[in-house]
Interface confidence: medium
């Protein structure tokens, strides 16, 4: 290995390295053989030491992480912002839908308030929780709404002479509601529409939140030591030879990056599928698959269902009178 | 008297942005999001190229660094030599993705499966029967007189500016226990700051 020329110093390298690591003791005064180096393997004398090499590796991995974060910043912001906006919008839709329904009860069936408000409130609370991922069954939510409403409708509108809120008859009436299909096909209709629209809404929000998670994961990837070595060799080893202004070759950079990102690039196939599947879902979000549409029209369907009960009131009162006779007798005692 | 903190239909925000010419619907916002996301469809496959283009790379210089020496930009050595005596790039690729990446791939597979099962098949009429069944006139039959409703045509009177329940001394929201006689619900009052309504009493 030839000795360095007599006028060679590591001055330039030293001033650059000082910016990375204040304190100059790691930079040789003049080029050295560098036999202890593991990454920037010298062809001749070098201005790098083992300690400098370690610092370069650390810096290279940090650079890579920052580059990755800046690459995903716009995408991350896009999904985070939209996830928040849609979640808030859906909550507002639910609140408006509840208000519509309460208005319908207050102005058409004042005798059913305030109990109806309570049941409506519970129903829409469950709707909100379901959208946010709660483990609630939509059919159960709808059944609970109609199960709760019917005893109030029966005791307040159809048979107002009965004493209120006696658990015995309420339980019997809840059972009768399903057995006698008191509300006709309306509960089933609401179940279908609400479950379809809420499922789609829920999965839409879940998908957006997963999108954020995907970006966050790749954003905070820690690169392997092997990758750190490759990056150091590409970005910093030229400095050891005093080549401060030279840049890596483009093709070489691509090869290194593909090596470092081999694992990350494997996400590509599933990411593409994610966007295309989300597009398909969004294209289908209308009519009964659009929760705004369904929830904001619920007041009307619930009104129709109560009218259905009223229409069949005479027959129902007779049948229920027999069916729940035992409970009623116990009440009158 | 207590007021219900939210109007049925109108939100003060409408009044503030009434001058805006183009208003977005939720569905148009969804479609816009998809269009923007589609511009990122190659995000992961393009990452290596993105990072190279955003880090110092020889573009106009005649000479460039290949990891070992200074070479001419278009020479065979420009891409090849830098990888010699280093470690096997193929080995690096063979290691497979990081555990966190594998986890996220599994989650993506799962959500993709869910999205596919939830998507409405193309060309399918969207449950037309369900969409319309029982919705036009309830189940009242042809004779509308059969329908008994406390306001005949099903109209709902809503108090002043559609703020209903104005006379009630308690809030309707079940966040408060029934019977709690409060002036407005704390939770909804918080909402009113950003989603308040018409002219409040």
């Amino acid at each position: 290995q030839p000795p360095p020329p007599p006028d060679a110093t590591c001055h330039q390298v030293r001033s650059f390295f000082q910016r990375l690591q204040p304190g100059l003791k790691w930079v040789p005064e003049t080029p050295v053989p560098g036999s202890d180096l593991q990454v920037c393997l010298p062809k001749g004398p070098t201005c790098c030491s083992r300690k400098m090499e370690e610092k370069y590796q650390l810096t290279a991995r940090l650079n890579m992480e920052q580059l990755l974060q800046s690459a995903s910043m716009e995408l991350k912001f896009l999904i985070i912002q939209n996830a928040a906006v849609f979640q808030e919008a859906f909550e507002i839709v639910v609140r408006h839908a509840k208000n519509y329904t309460n208005a319908m009860f207050k102005n058409n069936y004042p005798s059913l308030t305030p109990q109806a408000f309570e049941f409506v409130g519970e129903f829409f609370t469950d709707v909100s929780l379901y959208i946010l991922g709660s483990d609630i069954n939509v059919d159960d939510m709808v059944n609970e709404l109609f199960d709760s409403l019917f005893p109030v409708i029966y005791t307040q509108m159809m048979n107002p002479g009965l004493p209120e809120s006696v658990l015995d008859i309420n339980e019997c009436l809840r059972g009768a509601r399903r057995d006698l299909k008191v509300f006709g096909s309306f509960p089933k209709l609401i179940m279908t529409q609400v479950s379809k629209s809420l499922q789609v809404t829920r999965i839409f929000l879940q998908a957006l939140n997963l999108g954020i998670e995907v970006i966050n994961t790749t954003d905070h990837l820690k690169f392997s030591k092997d990758c750190g070595r490759m990056l150091t060799r590409m970005w910093y080893c030229s400095y050891c030879q005093g080549l401060m202004m030279v840049k890596p070759c483009g093709g070489y950079c691509n090869v290194v990056m593909q090596g470092c990102m081999a694992g990350v690039v494997e996400i590509d196939k599933y990411w593409r599928e994610y966007i295309l599947s989300l597009e398909e879902l969004v294209n289908g979000m209308y009519r009964i698959y659009d929760m705004e549409n369904v929830l904001l029209g619920l007041f009307s369907t619930i009104h129709d269902s109560i009218q259905y009960v009223q229409k069949n009131g005479g027959k129902l009162t007779t049948t229920i009178g027999k069916l729940c006779a035992h409970s009623q007798q116990r009440q009158y005692r | 008297s207590a007021y219900y903190p939210e109007d049925l239909f109108i939100d003060k925000k409408i009044l503030k942005v009434a001058h805006v010419e183009h208003e977005e619907t939720l569905s148009s916002r969804r479609r816009e999001l998809i269009q923007k996301l589609k511009s990122f469809i190659n995000f992961y496959s393009a990452l290596p190229g993105y990072i190279c283009s955003h880090s110092p790379v020889a573009e106009n210089d005649t000479l460039c660094w290949n990891g070992q020496e200074l070479v001419e930009r278009y020479s065979q050595k420009a891409a090849r030599n830098g990888m010699k005596n280093q470690f096997n790039l193929h080995e690096l690729k063979m290691k497979g993705p990081e555990p966190v990446v594998s986890q996220i791939i599994d989650k993506l597979k799962h959500i993709n499966q869910l999205l596919r099962t939830m998507s409405v098949p193309k060309g399918k009429v969207l449950d037309k029967s369900l969409d319309e069944e029982g919705l036009e006139s309830g189940d009242c039959g042809d004779d509308e007189d059969e329908c008994i409703g406390s306001s005949g045509d099903g109209m709902v009177k809503v108090k002043n500016q559609l703020r209903f329940l104005a006379e009630l001394a308690y809030d309707l929201d079940v966040d408060d226990a029934p019977g709690n006689k409060q002036h407005g619900n704390q939770k909804d009052n918080e909402i009113t700051t950003s989603h308040s309504v018409g002219n409040m009493p």
Partner: nanobody, 123 residues
């Protein structure tokens, strides 16, 4: 391009009647709960009535019993029949979707405001 065009307004004496229409293009309004709004000079825009996709309507007290909102899905149009008009009904009447939900600077489900139709009730 979504467009809502209101028409049918005019000058009418107290106690008179008018029927205003709102024709939509570029959107199928049969899937929306639609509403009529009005704005009197110097006043805030207020909602007057709404009609669900199934034809059920809701009204504010000030117009209850005098106004009737209806829709013709085949014509993609909603109507507001105004009877027994009063001077306080004087305003520009607009239609839009009822679920006009605003969130800060993000706005949704509004179909965009039309030019409105002027209703003047005066003797």
């Amino acid at each position: 391009q979504v467009q809502l065009v209101e028409s049918g307004g005019g000058l009418v004496r107290p106690g008179g009647s008018l029927r205003v229409s709102c024709a939509a293009s570029g959107v199928d309004i049969s899937t929306y709960t639609m509403a009529w709004y009005r704005q009197a000079p110097g006043e805030q825009r207020e909602s007057v009535a709404a009609i669900s996709t199934t034809g059920r309507s809701i009204y504010i007290d000030a117009v209850q019993g005098r106004f009737t909102m209806s829709r013709d899905n085949a014509k993609n149009t909603v109507y507001l029949q105004m009877n027994n008009l009063k001077p306080e009904d004087t305003a520009v009447y607009y239609c839009n979707s009822a679920d006009d939900l605003k969130i800060g600077t993000q706005y949704f489900k509004g179909l965009g405001w039309g030019q409105g139709t002027q209703v003047t009730v005066s003797s």
